[in-house]
Amino acid sequence: LLVSQGVLLKCQKGSCSNATQYEDTGDLKVNNGTRRNISNKDLCASRSADQTVLCQSEWLKYQGKCYWFSNEMKSWSDSYVYCLERKSHLLIIHDQLEMAFIQKNLRQLNYVWIGLNFTSLKMTWTWVDGSPIDSKIFFIKGPAKENSCAAIKESKIFSETCSSVFKWICQY
């Protein structure tokens, strides 16, 4: 099974005719407390823009990016280096559609590290590419303090101690 070819989430060539390939994506909680249901049609439409990128075996493709889901567990910093060694980075989530894609492909309900940590230098939550988190889109549950790193669970972002060991997601 080459998941890199989009087998797990078939929206090839922007076509979503095979309805049996989809599960319900479910609700996503946004910062103001309102909910919006992300449909499979939304997910497919958002992917139709870029069908040319091919990911490696073991990597999933979505919206022109490649995603790798770990099976083992590491601290946030070890996960960060692991992705770096693969010339990728810990997951940066840009919007709810991407969060829905991630959640759809997480086969467990435990915490998963993402590329977001609290930097004491900036005193703010910062993605690994240096950009700040958009508080209008995402709310982080838990303390914003030194040695806090972000993990996702059931489409929500939580503040956790960076030395905790969780699974992680790399992206390029």
């Epitope: 080459l2 890199s4 070819q5 990128v53 091919l54 990911c55 490696q56 075996s57 073991e58 990597w59 490649c66 790798w68 070890d78 280096v81 770096l84 060694e85 693969r86 010339k87 990728s88 390029y172």
Partner: antibody, heavy 117, light 110 residues
Amino acid sequence: SLEESGGDLVQPEGSLTLTCTASGFSFSGSYYMCWVRQAPGKGLEWIGCIYTGSSGSTYYASWAKGRFTITKTLSTTVTLQMTSLTAADTATYFCARDTGSTYWRYNIWGPGTLVTV
Amino acid sequence: DVVMTQTPASVEAAVGGTVTIKCQASQSIGSDLAWYQQKPGQPPKLLIYTASTLESGVPSRFRGSGSGTEFTLTISDLECADAATYYCQGTYRSSSISWPFGGGTEVVVK
């Protein structure tokens, strides 16, 4: 630039350590230093790489695991330790650097050093 | 391990002609493929990376294409200086990382 040294004539079942020395840059950045070999008249064969970042992770071809060990010894040197050598290990050994950018490519190569078993 | 299979082993063409070298990966490697040129007694020289990006200073007569498992190096307007052995090299980046080479293609220019 890169330069390999330590190539020699060695007896079967013997051991040898090759050194790769960098000039013009140090291994303080995060990239891969790799070893590749080429038997006389044959093709290139990847041996393994070491990541020069804090983790110092090493990756080897399946056939090289156990007999070959790559180590970063100083800020400008990487070594390849080879044990239980056989005639099949006779080759020119190259060290190469995989650029630190987001792209995978060996953009700097040494001239090679000959190992004869 | 990922295996890179290169064809043909040898190809002959006239000056001004075109040669095509193919490289196949046993698993998808995305666009993580490089092409090298090697002449006798010299280390390999990088020509193309990320399947199709020309290394600085390499003439545009060299063109790389492909992604996933199928890749091609095309050399057009052949010159005598192009006589060499060409290697593809994939990079596999998942649980482990490997950089396997293809077996090489000798290009003879008549």
